[in-house]
């Protein structure tokens, strides 16, 4: 079995303010078991956007049903985009751990740009 890769196929996504952004992410393997998280930015100051395992993220929905067997699509939609949402988003696979899951592999990132709503 080849080691899991996290694929973010879009380097750039441009969305109008007020619209919904779709950020695509797929994994290439079911192994290792563990959740996906999405972050804006990198490093210790990164902002958590979505955590499959726990938390409440009212603006975020998943494109696929994550409970379904063989699912490797971890794309998300973020609603009601504003200019403050601009930045680079990373899809990160975690490996099941005890007591805490461990970061395993990150996608290359998708840069979200927001254009002003047409007047």
């Amino acid at each position: 079995e080849e080691e899991l890769q996290v694929i973010q196929p879009d380097k750039f996504v441009l969305v109008a303010a007020g619209e919904t952004a779709t950020l695509r992410c797929t994994a290439t393997s079911l192994i290792p078991v563990g959740p996906i998280q999405w972050f804006r930015g990198a490093g210790p100051g990164r902002e958590l956007i979505y955590n499959q395992k726990e938390g409440h993220f009212p603006r975020v929905t998943t494109v696929s049903d994550l409970t379904k067997r063989n699912n490797m699509d971890f794309s998300i939609r973020i609603g009601n985009i504003t200019p403050a949402d601009a930045g680079t988003y990373y899809c990160v696979k975690f490996r099941k751990g005890s007591p805490d899951d461990v970061e395993f592999k990150s996608g290359a990132g998708t840069e979200l740009s927001v254009r002003a709503k047409p007047s």
Epitope: L30, G34, E54, G55, L66, T67, N70, K96
Partner: antibody, heavy 119, light 110 residues
Framework: QVQLVQSGAEVKKPGASVKVSCKAS????????INWVRQAPGQGLEWIAM????????HYNQIFKDRATLTTDTSTSTAYMELRSLRSDDTAVYYC????????????WGRGTLVTVSS | DIVLTQSPDSLAVSLGERATINCRAS??????????IFWYQQKPGQPPKLLIY???NRDSGVPDRFSGSGSGTDFTLTISSLQAEDVAVYYC????????FGQGTKLEIK
């Protein structure tokens, strides 16, 4: 940390019903399947059924399809397993278990609920 | 339905020696490039604990003396050097279709 806390031991008469609860914490309840497994005294493991709390999709072992019903209460992150028309050979420890990888496996287990069926 | 048959039903192994438990499926459990076999350890009075998933992947925190192998219909759980705390009943489970368990193998110290 994932925890599954099950209801206490039950003693039932033949022909009665029992409803065992499993309260989940430490994760988003609707993102992971819950399985129910039983173990008669001194015997092996027997899979009963599974439920996806996000949409109440269920799969049942044919042996239990007519007597078991799985439900969830997403407001309290609790799963339930009801078994009807109890017989003495239903005496067993009943376990709930969470499937962390949507692999139809059992990653995290409750401590079990002993159900005794005796006249 | 796929039936899993474990062998032996019980075995006794000396401390530090290798223990091998087999699980045979009545038909192939391989699908979508994965072997849908899992191994659990159950100690007396405790719930089972997942050891190996998808035939050969150790679960989090499982010592590396435990390993899983096999493909198709024949699978093996190996404990490379038996420790006293490994005394337990071991179960295989498949999820190629809806889950079923093997009958269990009781492992004791010789």
């Amino acid at each position: 940390q994932v925890q599954l806390v099950q209801s206490g031991a039950e003693v039932k008469k033949p022909g009665a019903s029992v409803k065992v609860s499993c309260k989940a914490s430490g994760y988003t309840f609707t993102n992971y399947w819950i399985n129910w497994v039983r173990q008669a005294p001194g015997q092996g493991l027997e899979w009963i059924a599974m439920i996806d709390p996000s949409d109440s999709e269920t799969h049942y072992n044919q042996i239990f399809k007519d007597r078991a019903t799985l439900t969830t209460d997403t407001s309290t992150s609790t799963a339930y397993m009801e078994l009807r028309s109890l017989r003495s050979d239903d005496t067993a420890v009943y376990y709930c278990a969470m499937d962390y990888g949507s692999l139809y496996a059992m990653d995290y287990w409750g401590r079990g609920t002993l159900v005794t069926v005796s006249s | 339905d796929i039936v899993l048959t474990q062998s032996p039903d019980s075995l006794a192994v000396s401390l530090g020696e290798r223990a091998t438990i087999n699980c045979r499926a009545s038909q192939s459990v391989r699908s979508s490039g994965y072997n849908w076999i899992f191994w659990y350890q159950q100690k007396p009075g405790q719930p089972p604990k997942l050891l190996i998933y998808l035939a050969s992947n150790r679960d989090s925190g499982v010592p590396d003396r435990f390993s899983g192998s096999g493909s198709g219909t024949d699978f093996t759980l190996t404990i490379s050097s038996l420790q006293a705390e490994d005394v337990a009943v071991y179960y295989c489970q498949h999820s190629r279709e809806l889950p079923t368990f093997g009958q269990g193998t009781k492992l004791e110290i010789k």
